[in-house]
Interface confidence: low
């Protein structure tokens, strides 16, 4: 169980000529509202196919009236999040459809008129519990900026919200801040509560209270770009004033990057991150325009077509850099559950799962009990992909179909006699012993050395094993 959340940041005319000035028709004022629709999988589904994962409608936004001389603004939006609850597992791969609707408030016969203004569709992979993903999409002449995430609710955890954590009254074996999970009681799940102030953009945590930095960032809260940190270089003598190692001469000294490029060290060399409009080893080549297709990974290029005009790349979630060319090593976030091996193939993230686990992030423990019944009151035990029945007393075999003699294993200690019984076995203990298996010696004073006999049972009485 969980909820998908969508936050619309802005909706307005896209850049460039021919952008509309107003969402309203000439008939008068209007207001906007949004509809979100979620469909499972990444396939291109027909627009009219049902929103199988759910749908939600926003409130109406404030009334907008076009002001002829004013520049076209970002339009007034409805407040709050759009939330789509999901009851079952989060699928990980889904299609997100966002529709912008216009409600005309002029003198309409029969009340307000609705019309679809823009529709964007994104096919995405998204793990539940991850950070907000930001996106910018064009729909015709309109531009929509939004963020979204999926999060688990109630006691669900995991990237698919499929594992249930149950609160315990007993002290946790897992240490402070960790909670035991069912059904794998030995596996502990840390709620993702990072150190206070840890950068949402450049930091992450695997244990409560920590703040680990993504590549290129440093500092206790991952707010310092690595290239500016005085403690980053590990060459040279230690500085008594800073407590850091003072960097010695390095490949970036004297900044080999031209045209305002920033230099970062690579093993034995350097790399220039170039500003818009420049590229090359040292940012020495200029004259790039949108016509050159400089925005990678689905980035949206905005800018003029003439050689002197710079451009801006609006990057999709997960990419950064002047040209959306850089992506954080997504495997550093350890997205593969249950010991799965993470492979970042650049164009996709893949988890190679251990035996007994499946799913995009190895989040599903393959339940070999599905469709398998254990006979005669036995219960199916799931574990690592293997099907095993825990049989009721008196039965055995793979599916508990074979009758078993409960006395065959000689369960009664110290010479006690075993009797098969409809609900199990009974031990008749030899003098001087007691217990369900005759395991406790009785002292001469008639008091057992271990737990006292339950009321109504004297030492030596046959005891039924429940």
């Amino acid at each position: 169980a969980g909820v998908f959340e969508l936050q619309i940041h802005s909706f307005g005319p896209g850049p460039g000529p021919g952008a509309p000035r107003s969402p309203c028709s000439a008939r008068g004022p209007c207001r906007l509202f949004f509809r979100v629709c979620l469909k499972p999988g990444l396939s291109e589904e027909a627009a009219e196919s049902p929103c199988a994962l759910g749908a939600a409608l926003s409130a109406r936004g404030p009334v907008y009236t076009e002001q002829p001389e004013a520049p076209a603004p970002d339009l007034p939006l409805p407040n709050g999040l759009l939330q789509v609850p999901f009851r079952d597992a989060w699928p990980g791969t889904f299609s997100l459809i966002i529709e912008t609707w216009r409600e005309e408030l002029g003198d309409q016969i029969g009340g307000p008129a609705w019309s679809l203004l823009a529709r964007v569709t994104r096919r995405r992979r998204l793990a539940a519990g991850g950070p907000w993903a930001r996106d910018i999409q064009r729909a015709g002449a309109w531009e929509l900026r939004f963020s979204y995430r999926a999060r688990c609710e109630l006691l669900a955890v995991g990237t698919a919200c499929t594992r249930l954590c149950r609160p315990r009254s007993a002290p946790s074996r897992c240490g402070p801040g960790l909670r035991p999970c069912a059904p794998l009681e030995d596996e502990c799940e840390a709620p993702p509560v990072c150190r206070a102030g840890c950068s949402l953009e450049h930091g992450f945590c695997e244990q409560p209270g920590e703040c680990r930095c993504l590549e290129g960032w440093t500092g206790p809260l991952c707010t310092v770009p690595a290239s500016t940190s005085s403690c980053l270089g590990l060459r040279g003598p230690s500085s008594a004033t800073t407590g850091c190692l003072v960097p010695g001469p390095g490949p970036c000294d004297g900044n080999p990057c031209a045209n305002g490029g920033s230099c970062s060290e690579t093993p034995g060399s350097f790399e220039c991150t170039c500003p818009r409009g420049f590229y090359g080893l040292r940012c020495e080549v200029s004259g790039v325009t949108c016509a050159d297709g400089p925005c990678f990974n689905g980035g949206l290029c905005v800018g003029g077509a003439d050689p002197d005009s710079a451009y801006i790349c609006h990057c999709p979630p997960g990419f950064q850099g002047s040209n959306c060319e850089k992506r954080v090593d997504r495997c550093s976030l350890q997205p593969c559950r249950n010991g799965g091996l993470c492979l970042d193939l650049g164009h996709a993230l893949r988890c190679r799962c251990r035996a007994g686990f499946a799913g995009p992030r190895c989040e599903h423990n393959l339940d070999d009990c599905a469709g398998r019944a254990c006979a005669n009151g036995g219960t199916c035990v799931e574990g690592g992909g293997a099907h095993r029945c825990s049989c009721a007393l008196g039965f055995g075999g793979r599916d508990c179909r074979e009758r078993a003699d409960p006395c065959a294993a000689r369960p009664c200690a110290h010479g006690g006699r075993c009797y098969a019984h409809f609900s199990g076995l009974v031990c008749a203990c030899a003098p001087g012993y007691m217990g369900s298996r005759c395991e406790f010696p009785v002292h001469p004073d008639g008091v057992s050395a271990l737990p006292a006999a339950p009321p109504g049972l004297r030492p030596g009485d046959p005891q039924r094993y429940l």
């Epitope: 790399e271 790039v288 297709g293 990678f296 992506r327 164009h347």
Partner: nanobody, 130 residues
């Protein structure tokens, strides 16, 4: 530091085919997609020329006019390997073939320019006899 190692060259009759490979090491697999890569060749006594390139990020490909429809460049992200499939070889394809890489992106229209590439392999010889 990125190291590039080419293989797959050899002697072949005109009209034959070859597949050249270039393995990139010393660069994290997770960021291999950020390398723009290309194949260049140099025949004895001639200038080095770019024959095919594939840019980072989008994987846009570019080819020299002399090899269009005969050469195909591709990149195997899982194995950090660049390939050049050569069909219908001609004697004028005889040259030393070099693999080159640059960190980040290179505009496709300029991706066959040698001085934009930082990392170079040692080369593999292709000889085509008529």
């Amino acid at each position: 530091q990125v190291q590039l190692a080419e293989s797959g060259g050899g002697s072949v009759q005109a009209g034959g085919s070859l597949r050249l490979s270039c393995v990139a090491s010393g660069y994290p697999s997770s960021t291999y997609y950020m390398l723009s890569m290309a194949w260049f060749r140099q025949a004895p006594g001639k200038e080095r020329e770019g024959v095919a390139a594939i840019t980072s990020g989008t994987g846009s490909t570019s080819y020299a006019d002399s090899v269009k429809d005969r050469f195909t460049i591709s990149k195997d992200y899982a194995n950090n390997t660049l390939y050049l499939h050569i069909n219908n070889l001609k004697p004028e394809d005889t040259a030393m073939y070099y693999c080159a890489a640059a960190s980040g992106w290179i505009v496709p229209s300029r991706s066959l320019t040698a001085n934009l590439y930082r990392y170079w392999g040692q080369g593999t010889q292709v000889t085509v006899s008529s």
